[in-house]
Interface confidence: low
């Protein structure tokens, strides 16, 4: 009878102790161990038969009486050198070896192109023992081959630190062709030619190619693997594939699109993010890039006063991210302002056109001309001053800031005056005598309060001094006007 | 324009099997793949297989192979995707999208999504 | 199979805020098969990045993303409330296509 035993964590004695009676000799198994799981040695025997004493370390059997027949060398027997068979068939293969009981610590393992196969394969080693060897068949099947199981199979005894090997199995597993290489997708120039490769393997070899070109075959005849198919160029999108061919079938590769590269859709929601008084942030979507990278866009800017003359400001700027700030523009403008997209073919068509308005922002200059001078009678400065130019207010004028510094004796204060927009004069209390007074003016719109003029000085003297003539802005150059009595 | 209208609401019983659909309109149907993408509850995205409408060919994750069968009717424009011997850990949203190859590979259009329940 | 790893897996954040997310490859994927998806509560995904810096059609310009090689970011310019979602990246280079385990941008 067979009897299995499941592979442990230790090897485990062929003969656990003496064997009672005689050997068999029928040839019936007496040990089979399958190999399912983690590799365990395939064979591990201790024979302590009586009268047979062991002998050390051989390798090659000697002579050891006169009674004793000459032992022949340890060997594999020849076996199937080659099996041929398709995918997901079964296969079952061996190696037999005779070795003597003299033999220790035995072991067999199967290895696959140079690498020990350790696991997860369905090995058994079965032994038929006799009064002077032990003749042990290993077996290693595959329920269902895949490709990944060609190759070259071999057994490895070791006995008493000595390694006998077999002579190689070589399996080889037949199946559709193969890709190791397939088509792949490009964009490409109109009317340019390119190239596109594909290549699969067998077995069986030879593997022949056809290429599809929208569903129908280019090539008439097949040509060997690897092929490469030079397209001479092509003019709308195309879907190419490669049949793989074999005496198993056909294999297809998966289609790729050879996209032309067009100029790019032209860019969609161009929209305002932010709006100074000088200056619009605006981002938008690109459109299709036409299968080739944007290269950079273009933002055109005119200005929608029908009064204008028509003239279009071009800023360029990078393609990424998608957003730009156009900058010098005027305050209280509106404006039409359209994106445009390049790619290495041509500009995109410019978006739709949309308005955009700068705000008001704080005027650019300050009035203008600024006098001040002394009415002693009314104990009064009088402020006299123009107007900045309308273009500069940048925005609607909502009156003017006076800032006027007494000092006298180190005493220094500021006060601040808001006049309204109507005016072009103001009068201010004298705050301190025997002081200069400072008087600077800034316009003032929605947007902000502008820039202050330069200082204008005037000496307010003590009670009772002479009138004086008025002090005012100065020339440009003069850094420091004063009144001059 | 582009949509993926995806079957309704499936529960069935753990052992069973399910078939998903997915309807294509408003594009060359033949041209883009088709990928079925799982989502578990509170879960992550996990990418099933693709079906090449052109040719039929299938490309799965090792994952749910034996587990996911994908398959097409082009004369309706819709793929399917079955699955097999349900267990609880199918429970999922399966989606559908449109896969967008140009020297690249990601996924530009998806379904609304199938609920697929397997309780007892 | 190449492994997506992002982070962080959760965060909270203001409307106004910056808000960087990354990704990082467990092997080299060139740029063009790196792409990122947004999907908000009981939706599906949606293309938001794809080719690592390119705005899918519809996707606001506060949205931009970098990288190249093993590590991607996603980058929120203000964040909104209308972001609140769950952030994945994708990489389109090797079958199986996978997907970092996402990142869910919540509202503080």
């Known amino acids: 009878a067979i009897t299995e035993a499941r592979e442990e964590a230790k090897p485990y004695p062929l003969f656990p102790g003496p064997f009672p009676g005689s050997l068999q000799t029928d040839h019936t198994p007496l040990l089979s161990l399958p190999h399912a799981s983690g590799y365990q040695p395939a064979l591990m025997f201790s024979p302590t038969q009586p009268g047979r004493p062991h002998t050390g370390n051989v390798a090659i059997p000697q002579v050891t009486s006169v009674e004793s027949k000459p032992l022949p060398p340890l060997a594999f027997k020849h076996t199937v050198g080659h099996i041929i068979l398709s995918e997901h068939k079964g296969v079952k293969f061996n190696c037999s070896i005779s070795v003597p009981n003299i033999y220790q610590d035995t072991t067999i393992s199967w290895w696959k192109d140079g690498k020990e196969l350790l696991g997860a394969h369905h090995a058994i080693t079965q032994f038929y023992p006799d009064d002077e060897v032990t003749a042990i068949i290993a077996s290693f099947s595959i329920t269902s081959v895949q490709r990944s199981d060609n190759g070259s199979y071999i057994c490895k005894m070791k006995i008493n630190n000595e390694e006998i090997v077999s002579d190689p199995i070589y399996i080889e597993v037949q199946g559709l062709p193969h890709f190791t290489k397939q088509p792949e997708s490009m964009n490409v120039t109109r009317n340019t030619a390119f190239n596109l490769t594909c290549q699969a393997v067998g077995p069986p070899e030879p593997v022949n190619i056809f290429w599809v070109q929208n569903s129908s075959r280019v090539n008439e005849q097949p040509e060997k693997s690897p092929s490469v198919l030079t397209v001479p160029g092509l003019t709308e999108m195309a879907v190419f594939s490669c049949e793989a061919h074999n005496d198993k079938g056909l294999t297809v590769s998966k289609g790729v699109q050879i996209n032309i590269k067009a100029i790019p859709s032209p860019p969609t929601e161009v929209s305002i993010r932010n709006s100074t008084a000088h200056s619009i942030l605006i981002s938008w979507v690109p459109g299709f890039d036409g299968y080739s990278p944007f290269r950079n866009c273009s933002i055109q800017v005119k200005e929608a006063d029908p009064l204008s003359n028509g003239s279009v400001m071009i800023f360029n700027t990078s393609a990424l991210p998608h957003l730009y700030q156009i900058k010098q523009l005027q305050a209280l403008a509106n404006y039409s302002i359209g994106v445009s997209c390049m790619n290495e073919i041509g500009w995109s068509a410019v978006s739709p056109w949309i308005l955009a308005s700068t705000t008001e922002g704080a005027p650019s200059v300050a009035p203008l001309n600024v006098t001040v001078f002394l009415n002693e009678s009314s104990d009064n400065v009088d402020i006299r001053w123009m107007k900045p130019p309308t273009k500069q207010q940048d925005g609607e004028l909502v009156g003017y800031r006076i800032s006027h510094v007494w000092q006298s004796a180190g005493i220094s204060k500021e006060l601040l005056e808001e006049v309204g927009q109507n005016g072009s004069r103001a009068r201010i209390s004298v705050q301190v005598h025997n002081a200069t007074c400072t008087v600077r003016i800034a316009a003032v719109t929605r947007g902000g309060v502008g820039p202050f003029s330069d200082p204008v000085k005037i000496f307010i003297p003590a009670h009772g001094w002479v009138d004086y003539a008025p002090s005012s802005t100065p020339a440009p150059g003069n850094a420091d006007p004063v009144l001059i009595i | 324009q582009v949509q993926l209208q995806q079957s309704g609401p499936e529960l069935v019983k753990p052992g069973a099997s399910v078939k998903l659909s997915c309807k294509a309109s408003g594009y060359s149907f033949t041209t883009y793949d088709i990928n079925w993408v799982k989502q578990r509850p509170g879960q992550g995205l996990e990418w099933i297989g693709w079906?090449?409408?052109?040719?039929?060919?299938?490309k799965y994750n090792e994952k749910f192979k034996g587990k996911a069968t994908l398959t097409l009717d082009t004369s309706s424009n819709t793929a399917y995707m079955g699955l097999h011997s349900l267990t609880s850990e199918d429970s999922a949203v399966y989606f559908c999208?449109?896969?967008?190859?140009?020297?690249?590979?990601?996924?530009?259009?998806w379904g609304q999504g199938t609920t697929l329940t397997v309780s007892s | 199979e190449i492994v997506l790893t992002q982070s962080p897996t959760t965060m909270a954040a203001s409307p106004g805020e910056k808000i960087t997310i990354t990704c990082s490859a467990s092997s080299s994927v060139s740029s063009n098969y790196l792409h990122w998806y947004q999907q908000k509560p009981g939706f599906s995904p949606k293309l938001l990045i794809y080719r690592t810096s390119n705005l899918a059609s519809g996707v606001p310009a506060r949205f931009s993303g970098s990288g190249s090689g093993t590590s991607y970011s996603l980058t929120i310019g203000t964040m909104e409330a209308e972001d609140v979602a769950t952030y994945y990246c994708?990489?389109?280079?090797?079958?199986?296509?996978?997907f970092g385990a996402g990142t869910k941008l919540e509202l503080k």
């Open positions: 994708q990489q389109g280079r090797i079958v199986p296509l996978t």
């Open positions: 999208a449109r896969g967008y190859y140009d020297n690249l590979y990601y996924f530009d259009y």
């Open positions: 079906i090449y409408p052109r040719d039929g060919s299938t």
